[in-house]
Amino acid sequence: KAMHVAQPAVVLASSRGIASFVCEYASPGKATEVRVTVLRQADSQVTEVCAATYMMGNELTFLDDSICTGTSSGNQVNLTIQGLRAMDTGLYICKVELMYPPPYYLGIGNGTQIYVIDPEPCPDSDF
């Protein structure tokens, strides 16, 4: 039994620096507690963007200062990352861990390439 994690290959952030994508996992067991972590890989550097642990059937709760929000539905997690700028362009990888009950399972997606384009500053208007 293995755990497969699927996520979209490419997402374009909105002009307000918001990007959303779905992370879906095929659970080999009946997990009641799941941890979802978003990792960013760019220039061979890996950083943890955010992480949340949730009980199946309950809402996904990130820390108050997190740039991520999300909702869960069954084996699907809808992730939203806010406050993105052009320099944040990179591969965002969804890591899913079935925490409880044992056995623990690990699943890592192939990553979603998020492209962020900084908006052009508004030209001064002469009115």
Epitope: K1, A2, M3, H4, E33, R35, L39, V46, E48, A51, T53, K95, E97, M99, Y100, P102, P103, Y104, Y105, L106, G107, I108
Partner: antibody, heavy 119, light 108 residues
Framework: QVQLVESGGGVVQPGRSLRLSCAAS????????MHWVRQAPGKGLEWVAV????????HYADSVEGRFTLSRDNSKNTLYLQMNSLRAEDTAVYYC????????????WGQGTLVTVSS | EIVLTQSPGTLSLSPGERATLSCRAS???????LAWYQQKPGQAPRLLIY???SRATGIPDRFSGSGSGTDFTLTISRLEPEDFAVYYC?????????FGPGTKVDIK
């Protein structure tokens, strides 16, 4: 830099208890799965237990389930392994190890502490 | 649990030679969640490879990992004197996390 230092090993009689400590520095324990791995004299490596992230979830190898208990003191950035009802087959060097970013491979290890269970 | 078998048990080679170590799993190791470690006498193990083929920080490029599913290989392209040690594979896709019994690489 990341450092793990175990202590608390020694000689103990069968049926008795011992508590091992693992002092971590250079990172925050709660951001990682923290594991104990043991190695009996002249033998291979055996995974013993893990305490996950916020410390609520712990998983144990069948060989120690019900006898060993993991805990953590975040203020001291220290991990503990309470070993009860010790048996001769628990004799080993016990290593504290940090799980990796991409899963439970072990990217940093302590130097190990020897536990000898003998009458 | 996933049982890992390593072969050969002992590999006797000379410095400069190529070493090929095998690790076989009793069931598929999902998404190549397999690591390799090196251990020298009296020392803690050292991570060499994770994810079946990714080299850990500071590991020389003479070490390489490959494989998927149930069959994995660690290759040391040219043995250096400091490479003579015991090598373990480990799976981390599900608990309990298990190690192979090890392959000892010694000097011929």
């Amino acid at each position: 830099q990341v450092q793990l230092v175990e202590s608390g090993g020694g000689v103990v009689q069968p049926g008795r208890s011992l508590r091992l400590s693992c002092a971590a520095s250079g990172f925050t324990l709660s951001n990682y799965g923290m594991h104990w791995v043991r190695q009996a004299p002249g033998k291979g490596l055996e995974w013993v237990a893990v305490i996950w992230y916020d410390g609520r979830n712990k998983h144990y190898a069948d060989s120690v389930e019900g006898r060993f208990t993991l805990s953590r003191d975040n203020s001291k950035n220290t991990l503990y392994l309470q070993m009860n009802s010790l048996r001769a087959e628990d004799t080993a060097v016990y290593y504290c190890a940090r799980g990796g970013v991409w899963g439970s491979y072990f990217d940093y290890w302590g130097q190990g502490t020897l536990v000898t269970v003998s009458s | 649990e996933i049982v890992l078998t390593q072969s050969p048990g002992t590999l006797s080679l000379s410095p400069g030679e190529r070493a090929t170590l095998s690790c076989r799993a009793s069931q598929s190791v999902s998404s190549s969640y397999l690591a390799w470690y090196q251990q020298k006498p009296g020392q803690a193990p050292r991570l060499l490879i994770y994810g079946a083929s990714s080299r850990a920080t500071g590991i020389p490029d003479r070490f390489s990992g490959s494989g998927s599913g149930t069959d994995f290989t660690l290759t040391i392209s040219r043995l250096e004197p400091e490479d003579f040690a015991v090598y373990y594979c480990q799976q981390y896709g599900r608990s309990p996390f298990t190690f192979g019994p090890g392959t000892k690489v010694d000097i011929k």
